[in-house]
Each structure stands twice: as C-alpha cells, then as structure tokens.
Interface confidence: medium
C-alpha cells in the first residue's frame, strides 16, 4: 500500500515562516501533487500549491516557493506575514496522484514544543481520506 509522509517545520530565521515537505512512498510515477492547509483538499482545506511534472507549478498566497525535491517529494515555503499566515497548530495536507495507485493523501502539523529550525526526519503519516 502506498504511503504519504508530511513534515512541517518552522524556520528559525523567520518564526512565522513554514516549510512543508511531502513525499510519496510507492512504486508508481507521480503526476500531480496538491498541497492544502486547514484540512484535506476538497474537505474544507484551501489549496496552496499544485505541482505537475510537465505542466508546471501553480501556487497561491501565502505560498512563496513550491518545488520538486525529488521525483517523489516536494517542498513548499510559506510566507508568515498577514492575516492569512499559518499558525503553530495549522494542519497541512499533501495529496499525490500516482499511476496506477490513484490518489493518496496525508496531513501533518508542526510537532508540539518543536524548536524552530529543528525537526525529526520524515516518517510516513497515516493516510487520511477526505470526509
């Protein structure tokens, strides 16, 4: 069964800036990644970025930079200023479309009492389904 992992980190230099990293553990080829916050995409969550290997990357504020890290993982940096900035307990979700596995999504948030700039290595998060 494929798995998705999500890692959320607060930047040490900008305490209201977040980095979200997501990866897909599966055998298929990734063709689409959607990053959202506030809940799963399609279930109250708001899309922050959509990444497609051929058709490019689209992102919406407060997303600042979305990019592919590897063929099966991405990262997204969020700006931390303004009313739409994330807070420490914000939930971020990543959904991967893979062939032939279909769509898989997982969510994560900043670990409690985490120090800025420090984070544990990514571990597979439980698969969450849109309600």
């Amino acid at each position: 069964t494929p798995e998705v992992w999500v890692q959320v980190r607060m930047e040490a230099t900008e305490l209201s800036s977040f980095t979200i990293r997501c990866g897909f553990l599966g055998s298929g080829s990734i063709s689409l990644v959607t990053v959202s916050w506030g809940g799963p995409n399609g279930a109250g969550g708001t899309t922050l970025a959509v990444l497609h290997p051929e058709r490019g990357i689209r992102q919406w504020a407060p997303a600042r930079q979305a990019r592919w890290e590897t063929q099966s993982s991405i990262s997204l940096i969020l700006e931390g200023s303004g009313a739409s900035s994330p807070c420490a307990n914000t939930t971020f979700c990543c959904k991967f479309a893979s062939f032939p596995e279909g769509s898989w999504e997982a969510c994560g948030s900043l670990p409690p009492s985490s120090d800025p700039g420090l984070s544990a290595p990514p571990t597979p998060a439980p698969i969450l389904r849109a309600d």
């Epitope: 479309a97 032939p100 279909g102 769509s103 389904r129």
Partner: antibody, heavy 120, light 106 residues
C-alpha cells in the same frame, strides 16, 4: 476540441481475434494515460486495459489478462486494443477514454464506442 | 478487486426535487468519481475526487463521502438529468464501476 473516435468493432466467432483503434485529436495525446472501458449488454461498465502516457506500463484486470493487449502510437495519436481468444462475455461496446491527471485520473473524455459481438 | 454497490438501482423523482444516490465500496477507497450516461451516449464525467465538479457540470450536482460510503446529490432535479449514474473508484487497480443508478423523471 478533444475527440476520440473508436473503430474496428464487429462480429467475431468465439476464439477469434479483433483489433480496435482509437484515433485521438484536439490534445497532446502523448501526455495522457488512456483506457479501454467496455459496456456490457447489461449496461455494466468494466475497465479492460490502461496504458500510461509513455506506453511502457500497461494494466489489465484478471478477466482479460493474457488475452488483450493495449498499445499506443504517440506519433499517430492512436490507441489500440488487440483482443484474442474472444469469449461470448466479451460482447460489449468498447470505449476509449482519456485520463486527466490534473483531475486525479478521472476519465474526462470518452469516444462514441465501437460494438464488438462474439457469437458463433 | 473493489466492488462498488449503487443504490437504489432505479429511482423516480419529479423536477425540482432533491435526489441522493449512494455508492458503497467493499473496502475503503480514497476518492470517488461519478459519471452520467444518457441513452445512446457515452459516459460523461460529472464529479472527480469525491466532491469536485468537472468542467461544465451544473452546480446542482454535488458529491460527498469517505471510506466505504459515497453519495451523489442533485439539489433541484431538471428534465435533462434523466440518465444512469455510475460511481467509479481508483484506490486499487483495476479501476471498477458500480452497476449504476437509473434516474427517471415523473
């Protein structure tokens, strides 16, 4: 305008073979995964073959594995389905459909279908 | 393979009514797709990813659900909605379809 046009259907005897074609136009064919889906006389929809955009990986349900072969010619914008050892239960309308990965592989365009009847 | 069971198999409703049909999966699926098929026509994509409307689909259509239970709702039925509706999953290959719900208008 996206168009998918199937051809090659007809009447064939049990154990016989048939090759279906699907001519695609109006989009960059090589960028999309494609499927053959059939609709039985009872109106049930069944996936029979899927091929990724590069054409390297193909997928079949157990009901047709070893009997059906899906292929594509990206230069000709054409999808194929080679069917052999045909059985009466293969009688159906065969549709080709495009998978849009921006829609999480939903089949967003379908052809008009071509009818295959397997009967002695 | 995952079996999708649609209910009811046949339903009848009047224009302006709200109708809901369901799709139950034999094991948990991540997302559901819905297609509409009118007599003599090919299936048409209505909803992808459980709740997202495909291009050109009227907003009276909506989808919801999770796990093994999904539904398609038409908020105010119109004459042109008379058709058969199919659900489809792709959490595990092969992708499978439900047997359909035939919607007739009174």
């Amino acid at each position: 305008e996206v168009q998918l046009v199937e051809s090659g259907g007809g009447l064939v005897k049990p154990g016989g073979s048939l090759k279906l074609s699907c001519a695609a136009s109006g989009f960059t064919f090589s960028n999309f995964a494609m499927s053959w889906v059939r609709q039985t006389p009872a109106m049930r929809l069944e996936s029979v073959a899927t091929i990724v955009n590069g054409g390297i990986n193909t997928y079949y349900p157990d009901t047709v594995k070893g009997r059906f072969t899906v292929s594509r010619d990206n230069a000709k914008n054409t999808l194929y389905l080679q069917m052999s050892s045909l059985r009466s239960e293969d009688t159906a309308i065969y549709y080709c459909a495009r998978h849009d990965d921006f829609l999480y592989y939903a089949m967003d365009y379908w052809g008009q279908g071509t009818s295959v009847t397997v009967s002695s | 393979q995952i079996v999708l069971t649609q209910s009811p198999a046949i339903m009848s409703a009047s224009p302006g009514e709200k109708v809901t049909m369901t799709c139950s999966a034999s094991s948990s699926v991540n997302y559901m797709f819905w297609y509409q098929q009118k007599p003599g026509s090919s299936p048409r994509l209505l909803i992808y990813d459980t709740s997202n409307l495909a291009s050109g689909v009227p907003v009276r259509f909506s989808g919801s659900g999770s796990g093994t239970s999904y539904s398609l709702t038409i908020s105010r039925l119109e004459a042109e909605d008379a058709a058969t509706y199919y659900c489809q999953q792709w959490t595990s290959y092969p992708l499978t379809f439900g047997a359909g719900t035939k919607l007739d208008l009174k």
